[in-house]
């Protein structure tokens, strides 16, 4: 069967929402009321990869955009980026590893570990209005815990 994608939004454990910041960057900030409409809606695809009860491989695209979160080396450091793809070919069941995140549920929070770079996670800063990035530490200052709200298509 083809890849299945479900729409969702993410908030970090401080309740910051994710919004676009320019054409190829996401930032995290607190939103309320009408401003909530600014938050990014992801199209989360269930993709091929190593799977367990607590770990599900997913790809995170931006709804109705040909942009996917991907993990690449920049200046020898694992880096999160928004990558443009050919919409005729994506999403697909067998996504390239740079697009794959292990969605890990621990207690009531979710982590998104890069499949390409184990132990590197989608992260936000404590500070407001800062870019979403790939971080190599858990449990420190930076936030790696999220909640997900599925939304109707």
């Amino acid at each position: 069967a083809p890849v299945r994608s479900l729409n969702c939004t993410l908030r970090d454990s401080q309740q910051k929402s994710l919004v676009m910041s320019g054409p190829y960057e996401l930032k995290a900030l607190h939103l309320q009321g009408q401003d909530m409409e600014q938050q990014v809606v992801f199209s989360m695809s269930f993709v091929q990869g190593e799977e367990s009860n607590d770990k599900i491989p997913v790809a995170l695209g931006l709804k109705e955009k040909n942009l996917y979160l991907s993990c690449v080396l920049k200046d020898d450091k694992p880096t999160l980026q928004l990558e443009s793809v050919d919409p005729k070919n994506y999403p697909k069941k067998k996504m390239e590893k740079r697009f794959v995140f292990n969605k890990i549920e621990i207690n009531n929070k979710l982590e998104f570990e890069s499949a390409q770079f184990p132990n590197w996670y989608i992260s936000t800063s404590q500070a407001e209005n800062m870019p979403v990035f790939l971080g190599g530490t858990k449990g420190g200052q930076d936030i790696t815990d999220f909640t997900m709200q599925f939304v109707s298509s």
Partner: antibody, heavy 119, light 107 residues
Framework: EVQLVESGGGLVQPGGSLRLSCAAS????????MSWVRQAPGKRLEWVAY????????YFPDTVKGRFTISRDNAKNTLYLQMNSLRAEDTAVYYC????????????WGQGTLVTVSS | DIQMTQSPSSLSASVGDRVTITCRTS??????LTWYQQKPGKAPQLLVY???TLADGVPSRFSGSGSGTQFTLTISSLQPEDFANYYC?????????FGQGTKVEIK
């Protein structure tokens, strides 16, 4: 044997609130996603709330969004549905159902609890 | 939302009859379809998932087929315990919606 037992239903006035509970046994509750599905008299089944195994993911359709909240206590093997601002059209039998990790089918259902919203 | 339409809404059949229930969807759901059986006053029970895979403990007289937008549930030889309501449900995109049901009654 998997068992899901709902409770907390009853008669409530429009605008009122109610909290439903679902006690789970016979399986490792903390490893399964759970949902609430309702069936109004003479109507089709309607999925009204979802929560992932640890509570990190949720879903509500537009018909109940902002009025219903779903939660779980894995230590007590219990699922909850908090229903606020109830309307006559929320009158239904409410079932809790077990789901798998990838948000697909419901493999076990409880017997249901009746919620009646009427003045 | 994907709309689910079952046909017929009800049917009368005898023990031993072959019964076919159809579920049509307003969009392509591939094989992401489930069938449930519900007896009066009881909870629904899973019969078939992924359009054609029989759930554990379901008798082999039940079978599911189809993909895309048209699906069928077949009972090859109706038994007394099969008189019930049957529902299809898709799980392709949110919200996962149900068909209106098919009531299988004794002729």
């Amino acid at each position: 044997e998997v068992q899901l037992v709902e409770s907390g239903g009853g008669l409530v006035q429009p605008g009122g609130s109610l909290r439903l509970s679902c006690a789970a046994s016979g399986f490792d509750f903390s490893r399964y996603d759970m949902s609430w599905v309702r069936q109004a008299p003479g109507k089709r089944l309607e999925w009204v709330a979802y929560i992932s195994s640890g509570g990190g993911s949720t879903y509500f359709p537009d018909t109940v969004k902002g009025r219903f909240t779903i939660s779980r206590d894995n230590a007590k093997n219990t699922l909850y549905l908090q229903m606020n601002s109830l309307r006559a059209e929320d009158t239904a039998v409410y079932y809790c159902a077990r789901q798998n990790k990838k948000l697909t089918w419901f493999d076990y259902w409880g017997q249901g609890t009746l919620v009646t919203v009427s003045s | 939302d994907i709309q689910m339409t079952q046909s017929p809404s009800s049917l009368s059949a005898s023990v031993g009859d072959r019964v076919t229930i159809t579920c049509r969807t307003s969009g392509n759901i591939h094989n992401y379809l489930t069938w449930y059986q519900q007896k009066p006053g009881k909870a629904p029970q899973l019969l078939v998932y992924n359009a054609k895979t029989l759930a554990d403990g379901v008798p082999s007289r039940f079978s599911g087929s189809g993909s895309g937008t048209q699906f069928t549930l077949t009972i090859s030889s109706l038994q007394p315990e099969d008189f019930a309501n049957y529902y299809c449900q898709h799980f392709w995109s949110l919200p996962f919606t149900f068909g209106q049901g098919t009531k299988v009654e004794i002729k």
